[in-house]
Interface confidence: medium
Amino acid sequence: DPVLCFTQYEESSGKCKGLLGGGVSVEDCCLNTAFAYQKRSGGLCQPCRSPRWSLWSTWAPCSVTCSEGSQLRYRRCVGWNGQCSGKVAPGTLEWQLQACEDQQCCPEMGGWSGWGPWEPCSVTCSKGTRTRRRACNHPAPKCGGHCPGQAQESEACDTQQVCPTHGAWATWGPWTPCSASCHGGPHEPKETRSRKCSAPEPSQKPPGKPCPGLAYEQRRCTGLPPCPVAGGWGPWGPVSPCPVTCGLGQTMEQRTCNHPVPQHGGPFCAGDATRTHICNTAVPCPVDGEWDSWGEWSPCIRRNMKSISCQEIPGQQSRGRTCRGRKFDGHRCAGQQQDIRHCYSIQHCPLKGSWSEWSTWGLCMPPCGPNPTRARQRLCTPLLPKYPPTVSMVEGQGEKNVTFWGRPLPRCEELQGQKLVVEEKRPCLHVPACKDPEEEEL
C-alpha cells in the first residue's frame, strides 16, 4: 500500500518531519534508513531504521488527586523490517505502572460566617449596586478545600437622582470620492467627511455638555497613482537534477513573474513560483553497521592453572560483540570487537554477608493485568575480600585494575526465616487502564 514519506524522524517526539510526498511504497521510502513514513495522514510515524524501543513516555497523571494512587507510562517499538529486543514487532506498546501520591490529604469544605453590613451604593445618580461580604472561617477549610457558594452578594440600589448626558461624536462618515482614480486631471480633487453629535446627544434637563471640535473636515486628493498593470507568469524553467545519490529526493521547476512585470501597484502573479516532484534514484542508501550489546564475560581463568576461584590470584577474561546491519557499502562498526580485563574469581566462594537496607519499591506488575502488586527486597550481600584493586602484570606496563567476577555464596544470619532474600509485597491502588495513546487521539 502507498505511504506518506518523510525525510526525518524526530526521536524525542516520535513525529515525522519534512514531508517528501505520498504515493510511494514503504520499501522505496525506506531505501534511506534516515527516512520515516506514515500509513495515513496523522497516523503513527515509523522510522525506516532497524526497530528499537522508543524512550519511555512521561508518567501519566496520578489516577487520584489525593491519597495513594497509580500511574502508567509506555514505550513503543519503532522501526521497519525487523523486531525490537524481546522479539517484539514494530508498533507494539510496553507498559510500566508505579504507585503515586500527588497530595497526602484530601480537601475538606469550610463553612461561612454571617453576612456583614451593606456597603454604600456604587453611584451618586440613577441606579447602581451595593455589596455585602462574608468570611470562609466557620470552620476554616482544610487541605486546600473551600466554602460552597459566593463570598459576596450584590443588589440594585436607586439614588433617586437623574444623571446628565454629555454629548459625544459619532464616528466620521466616509470620505467623498475623488474625481479621478489614477494620475490627476486638470483640477485638484477634494474629499470631505462629516460627523454628528449623536453618540449620544447632550441632555436638556439636567443640561449635558456639547461635543467639542468641528462637525466636518476637508482635504485635497494628492499623489493619485498611475494606473496599475497586473503581472503574468513566464514559462516554467528546466527541471533541476535529482539532488540525492540514493533513495528518494525532490526536484524543482521555477518560473518568473515577468510576462509582464507588475507595474504601478498592479497585483503580483497568482500561484506558486516553484513546483516540486519526487525523484527516485533506485539506489539503496548505505546502511552503517551497529554494534550489538556486549556478550557475557568469559570465566575468569589463568593459563596453566586449573582454578583460581576463592584465591588472591588475578586472572583474565574477555567478552565480544557483533557488528550487525551493514549494507550497501555502509561504514563498518568503529571500535574493538573484543574487550579483555583482569579479574579475581569469586565464583561459588563462601563469603561472609550482611543484610542490605530495603530496596526502593519496584514497578507494579503486571502493568496491564489484574491485581498488580509492587515489591521491595532485602538481600544477603557478600563482603568482598580485601584483595589489591590493581596489579602490575608486566614490567613497564603500569598498574591494571582488577575486577571481582563470579557469583559467590554469601552467608548471613537468618532474617524472617530467610537466608538470601526477604521480600515484602503490596497491592497497587486505583489502577488506570492501559490504552494506546495513538487510538485515544483519533
Epitope: S25, E27, D28, N81, A282, P284, K327
Partner: nanobody, 119 residues
C-alpha cells in the same frame, strides 16, 4: 523442483556489452522479486540489482547505476541483465537469486555464469 539457469556470460573488452539471461522454473515466477548477485575472485557476494514481481520497480547498486539495466519477461519466466560500458572491476561470477534483496535473504540461487572484462 526449483531451477534457476543463467547464461550469456563470457570474455569481453573494457567498454563492451553483455546481456545475461536467467530461465526460472518450479515456482510462481510472476509473483517473486528477483535479483542479480555477483562474486569476484577472493571476495564475498555483492548485490548488483533487483526488480519487483511486476517489473514496475527496479533498484541498482551505486557501482553499476547508469550502466546496467535489469528487466524481466513474466510470460517467458526469464530475468535479464543488460551490461554496458563494462569495466575490469565488473569481472565476477554472476548469479540470479529469488528472495528479499533488501535483507539479503535469498531462497533460491542459480549455478552462475562467468563474466570476464579484460583488454
Amino acid at each position: 523442483e526449483v531451477q534457476l539457469v543463467e547464461s550469456g556470460g563470457g570474455l569481453v573488452q573494457p567498454g563492451g556489452s553483455l546481456r545475461l539471461s536467467c530461465a526460472a522454473s518450479g515456482f510462481t515466477f510472476g509473483s517473486a522479486d528477483m535479483s542479480w548477485v555477483r562474486q569476484a575472485p577472493g571476495k564475498g557476494p555483492e548485490w548488483v540489482s533487483a526488480i519487483n514481481s511486476n517489473g514496475g520497480s527496479t533498484y541498482y547498486a551505486a557501482s553499476v547505476k547508469g550502466r546496467f539495466t535489469i528487466s524481466r519477461d513474466n510470460a517467458k519466466n526469464t530475468l535479464y541483465l543488460q551490461m554496458n560500458s563494462l569495466k575490469p572491476e565488473d569481472t565476477a561470477v554472476y548469479y540470479c537469486a529469488q528472495g528479499n534483496w533488501y535483507t539479503e535473504e535469498y531462497h533460491y540461487w542459480g549455478q552462475g555464469t562467468q563474466v570476464t572484462v579484460s583488454g
